[in-house]
Every structure is written in C-alpha cells, then in structure tokens.
C-alpha cells in the first residue's frame, strides 16, 4: 500500500508568493511559493495519486503583515481552502496567547490540530478540551493512518502559552499515544511535529511504533540530488534514522516559508511496516501557475492589509535617528528603540529566580535602513516601520558563550569608520571600545544586564557563561561577517517578525522618546581602562 505525504512547515504567513529569499515578491515572473501556487501543485498530485495526505508541521502563525492584521483567521481560511488533513501546533501558534490560538484557528479549522505533549490544566482544560488532540486517525482510501503531534518543549520561552499549558518531554508524551494507536490496530503511524530536526531524529530513534517523522522548527532543508535553488541540504531526503528496535525510519522537513512542498512516497506492507520511502521537496517556482480562484481570494483579503499599513500605531516625540551616519558609527536612538522592543517582546516570567529569561539584545546597524521624522505629527505607521526594517526578518533567541559575544563585539568595530553594517546597536549591554587599539582587541569593557536578579544591574561579561541574546535572524545565520555567532551558537530559535515586534511595542507604549544614553562608548586614544 502506497502513501504520498505532502508536507509544509514554518510557513510563517507567506500566503502570497515571495521572492527567492522569501521576502516580498518584487518581480512576479521570478516569485515562489504562496498558497495559490501550493494549491495548484497539491491538486495536481491529488488527481494523479490515490492516497495523499497534506500535513503541516506548525508555525503557520507570525511572519508578515497578514498575521498582524488577520491574527490567524487567514491561516484557518486558506488551510481549509487547501484541505490540509492535519496540522501540528508550533511554538508561534501561541504568540497571541491561548485565546489567539483557540478563537481564530482551533475553532475554525476543518481539520484536526495536534500535539501530544501539551497538557492543559486548570480552567483552560475544559475550555480547550477537544479543540486540539494528541493524535488523529485519518481515513486514507481503504486504510487508516495515525498521526501523532508534538510541539517544542521550549515554547514557554519562545511564545506566550500562559500558565495553564504544560509542555512535556516529546518522547515521554508520544510513546503512550503511539501505544494507544497500536491497540486500535492502527499500524501506520506518522509523528508530525515542531521541535526541530535533532528532536525529529530522536523521535524516530526512540519512539517505538513511529513509521515516519515529519518535522519543523529548524527550517531544515533536505534534498537528494542537485538542489534546485539556493538552500544547501543538511542531508538526504528522506533522512533515514535507524531506530533502537532496528527499523529504518524516514525523517523529513521542507525548509520554510512555503517555498517548497515536501513530497514523500512511502510503501507499507500489509503489517504496516515501511518497505521503501523516496521523494524530494518540490520547489514551488513560477513554472507552477497560481490557482486563479485561490489567487482571487488572496487579492480580496489583501485589501484590508493595504488599509492597515497607513494607520497610526503610536507617536514619537523625538527624531528616530535611523540614519547610516549614526547607526553604523555610534549608538543611535533607533537602535535603542528596536532593541528595547526586542527585549519587551521576550518578557516571559517563567521562573521566580529570574526577572526575565533574557536581558540582552544586539542588532547590526546596517539592518536599520531609514530614520523616522517626528515632524509628521509624530505619527508612526506600519509603512514607516517597513522602511526602517524592509528585509522581512525575524528577531530570534540564541544561546551563546560570553567568549562568542566578546568576539562579536570585536567584529563590530574591526574595521570601524568605513560605514559598514556590522557595527552593533545594543540593549541590556554596556560596551566601551578603544578604537586606537588594533582590530580584534578594541573592546575594553563589556558589561551585561543580569537576569537572575530582582534588581537588574550590569556585571562584567563572563567568558565561560552561557547567555541568552535576542538578535536578528540575519546575525544568527552569520550575516555581516558574524561567522562566530553562526559557528558557536549553542541554541537558535526563530522569533517574531521584526516589524511586528517594533509595531507592537510602539502600540503598547503609545508615545515613545528613545534617547542616546551611553550604552555604547568609544574613544580613539589610549586610556586608563584595564582589560577584562
């Protein structure tokens, strides 16, 4: 019996087609992805093959103005239109709290939404009961297939699930659900979830009875043969894991942003064992036409977005200096504003010992593309912010050693004075540079804001300590020459859309007046600072 698994993950509100790098589509003839194009390909496969499942491994939420405006209603609507068969909850599905998941998505999806390792307690338990499930048995042709869901255990640190959801260890939670499916005589079981490629592989290895793992969260691109676009494969598709009980378990993921449609064909024997598996992600490029009826629907929903982007979010009573003359040379108040918004967006009081789990922010000055003038009645709109942050990136959470941060700050000024983008703006960090010293040895003081404290204060950076830092995905991926971050990071979780973070902060504050306040200091002559 042959099953075709079509899968997406980490689509992050790319409902419209995008450019090759998943940012805004500029030249339509070269654009990719989007739900209208995805539908064309899915329908083509459904017509050609008998047993097809369309699955999503989480993080449909968050990423473009579509989510900012429609708050998940767009996800339910278009996933229903594409007739997804099942979805696993990702961490970003909790970005607007549990209510922001229940109302727009859980109540409106016409397909099951899954996670076995999220347990509701207290008053939420009855409210959310039955709206998401640990597993689902799906009829496929004359057979049934079991799907078990899972979600990153880190979600409380990455999103806003509130206090009434407990995120359990994935493997511990999945095993009894798989066992339950076995007792129902369901012998073909797919684990569908959102915990990253490393955990996907562990699930394949450790959870008895799982035949296939379809994952997300780490935006992993797998490919067999010559890859069709710019993504470099992390391994073959499918990636085969040998389980502890000696079975070969295919593990797949399909990069992100709806750029590819994962396509995996599995052959099962009559006892539900995998005999063979093969496939590849399908690049959704312009050779695949956009479905006209879905496209028309997208255009109808688009209208509200254009109206939204010119509405006032809040006011500034000071000039927001986002000029390259400032942000690439010294502390600029636009950089301070953005970093403050980044920290504010990551307030998660999950432990009595810590006022917050993260206090530090770094931001490449070159990522700030425009100032905002306060003399326009102080008004700030989404459109204004899109000029400041035009790349459609995310503000991510990483864990780094102090020594890596020190290297990053040395890199920040290694060729100071040439208006290069790597000059870092900061939050929760006080840095002093001596620019008369040789490159690689210019950081003379680096103090960081404590987290395990009731009164936050600045302490010298410790080289061997592990710190959490919020930064643009561009930096986490080694952009602007920050190779040390990419190479040495201990953990990386993708965060919220950059513009969305700043716009939410401005709306919350109503009136803003960020100052230049001595977070970054530099001098050009030898001084009596001692080395740390």
């Amino acid at each position: 019996w042959e099953l075709t698994i079509l899968h997406t993950n980490d689509v992050h509100s790319r409902l419209e087609q995008t450019s090759e790098d998943s940012s805004k589509c500029v030249n339509a003839s070269r654009c990719m992805g989007g739900v209208a194009r995805l539908f064309t390909k899915v329908q083509q496969i459904r017509r050609a093959e008998p047993n097809v499942l369309l699955l999503d491994a989480g993080d449909q939420y968050q990423g473009t103005i579509w989510f900012t405006v429609y708050k998940g209603a767009e996800v339910a609507h278009f996933m229903n239109a594409l007739r997804y068969d099942a979805m696993a909850l990702g961490n970003h599905e909790f970005d607007n709290g549990v209510e922001g998941l229940i109302e727009p998505l859980l109540k409106e999806a016409k397909f099951p939404i899954l996670s076995a390792n999220i347990k509701a307690k207290g008053p939420l338990a009855s409210q959310i009961s039955g709206l998401y499930l640990p597993y689902k048995v799906l009829p496929v042709g004359d057979e049934v297939v079991g799907i078990v869901g899972y979600t990153s255990k880190e979600t409380p640190f990455l999103s806003n699930p509130g206090t009434n959801l407990v995120f359990e260890d994935e493997i511990t939670a999945l095993q009894p659900e798989v066992d339950k499916l076995k007792t129902l005589n369901v012998n073909k079981i797919i684990a569908l979830g959102h915990s990253g490629f490393e955990m996907d592989k562990l699930i394949a290895q450790k959870v008895r009875g799982v035949d296939v793992v379809v994952g997300g969260h780490s935006n992993t691109f797998l490919y067999t043969g010559n890859p069709p676009s710019k993504e470099v494969p992390a391994g073959k598709y499918p990636f085969i894991v040998t389980s502890d009980d000696g079975r070969k378990v295919p593990v797949v993921q399909a990069y992100a942003f709806g750029k590819y449609l994962g396509y995996l064909k599995i052959e099962f024997d009559e006892r539900g064992n995998v005999i063979s598996s093969h496939g590849n992600p399908i690049l959704l490029n312009s050779s695949i036409p956009e479905d006209p009826s879905i496209k028309a629907d997208i255009n109808k929903w688009r209208i509200k977005l254009d109206n939204y982007s010119t509405q006032e979010l809040g006011k500034t009573i000071v000039y927001l200096d986002g000029s390259s003359q400032s942000c690439r040379f010294r502390e600029c108040n636009m950089g301070n504003l953005i970093c403050d918004a980044m920290i504010n967006n990551n307030l998660r009081h999950t432990d009595e010992m810590f006022w917050n789990h993260v206090s530090m922010c770094i931001l490449n000055g070159g990522g700030i593309r425009s100032p905002i003038d306060e003399r326009n009645n102080g008004t700030i709109t989404w459109e204004n912010l899109a000029a400041v942050l035009p790349f459609g990136g995310t503000f991510d959470l990483v864990q780094l050693k102090g020594s890596t941060l020190k290297k990053a700050f040395e890199h920040s000024v290694h060729r100071y004075g040439q208006s290069t983008g790597e000059f870092l703006q900061v939050g929760g960090i006080h840095v002093v540079y001596d620019l008369s010293r040789k490159p690689g040895d210019r950081v003379v003081k680096l103090d960081v804001l404590c987290t395990k404290c009731r009164v936050p204060s600045y302490d010298p950076l410790k080289m061997d300590e592990v710190y959490k830092v919020i930064l643009p995905n561009f930096l986490a991926n080694g952009g602007d020459g920050f190779q040390m971050i990419k190479d040495e990071l201990l953990r990386h979780d993708s965060g919220d859309q950059d513009i969305n973070v700043v716009s939410t902060y401005i709306s919350k504050m109503k009136v803003i007046y960020p100052a230049v306040e001595g977070r970054i200091k530099a001098h050009h002559h030898h001084h009596h600072h001692h080395h740390h």
Epitope: R83, A109, K110, F111, G130, K136, V137, L138, P139, V144
Partner: nanobody
Framework: ALQLVESGGGLVQPGGSLRLSCEVS????????IGWFRQAPGKEREGVSC????????YYADSVKGRFTISRDNAKNTVYLQMNSLKPEDTGVYYC?????????????????WGQGTEVTVSS
C-alpha cells in the same frame, strides 16, 4: 467542551420506524463528519451511516441501505437517523460520533467524540 447527546431510542415492532436525534453542543456542526454506530449485545461496534461535514455525501452500511437515512440540520446543531422497516437484527445501542476532516468514514477509529448512546429494541 464538545458533547453529543442521542435521543429517540425505544421499543418498536419489526417493520416499524424510529427517528434518532443527536444533538451536538460545544462546536459548529458543519465542521464535523458525523457517524451513527450501533453495538448489539455481545457484538463489535459497527458503522451504520455517516454524513460528511459539508452534508454533501452520505454513506451507509450494506445492512441498512435503502432503510436508513442520515440527515443533518446544521442550524439546530442536530443530526438525525431515520430508521424504517426495522428488523430484530437492528437491535442495539446506537451511538453518534464526530470528527473533523475531509473524508467521511464508517471506521469507528477515526471518530474522536462520542455520545453516551440510546437503546433501540426491535421485537414483537
């Protein structure tokens, strides 16, 4: 929470009719496939009939084809099973069940929510 409550069961003579109702609360009916199942004493639970979420397709077990009709009133959040020409072998506890998805099925394993059941006895 999601709930299904069956009613309309009872004692009926062979050749008689009954209409079972399944009232659904806590969710929008038009998002759910609804199935009727029955369990005779000492036997496995068997699928009798089901109706797709859209109401556009209905399926029946061979044993009831032409005698039973499933229908739904989404406005009243209720699903009905009209049972005509009843036979003694139709005796059992009748359950209604629901699940979200695109493909209606008579396989009990795909149903996530179940009512408590209503008893039907066909006897002279």
């Amino acid at each position: 929470a999601l709930q299904l409550v069956e009613s309309g069961g009872g004692l009926v003579q062979p050749g008689g009719s009954l209409r079972l109702s399944c009232e659904v609360s806590g969710f929008t009916l038009d998002y759910y496939n609804i199935g009727w199942f029955r369990q005779a004493p000492g036997k496995e639970r068997e699928g009798v009939s089901c109706s797709s979420a859209s109401g556009g397709s209905t399926y029946y077990a061979d044993s009831v084809k032409g005698r039973f009709t499933i229908s739904r009133d989404n406005a009243k959040n209720t699903v009905y099973l009209q049972m005509n020409s009843l036979k003694p072998e139709d005796t059992g506890v009748y359950y209604c069940a629901a699940y979200r998805g695109w493909h209606p099925s008579l396989d009990a394993r795909v149903y996530d929510y179940w009512g408590q059941g209503t008893e039907v006895t066909v006897s002279s």
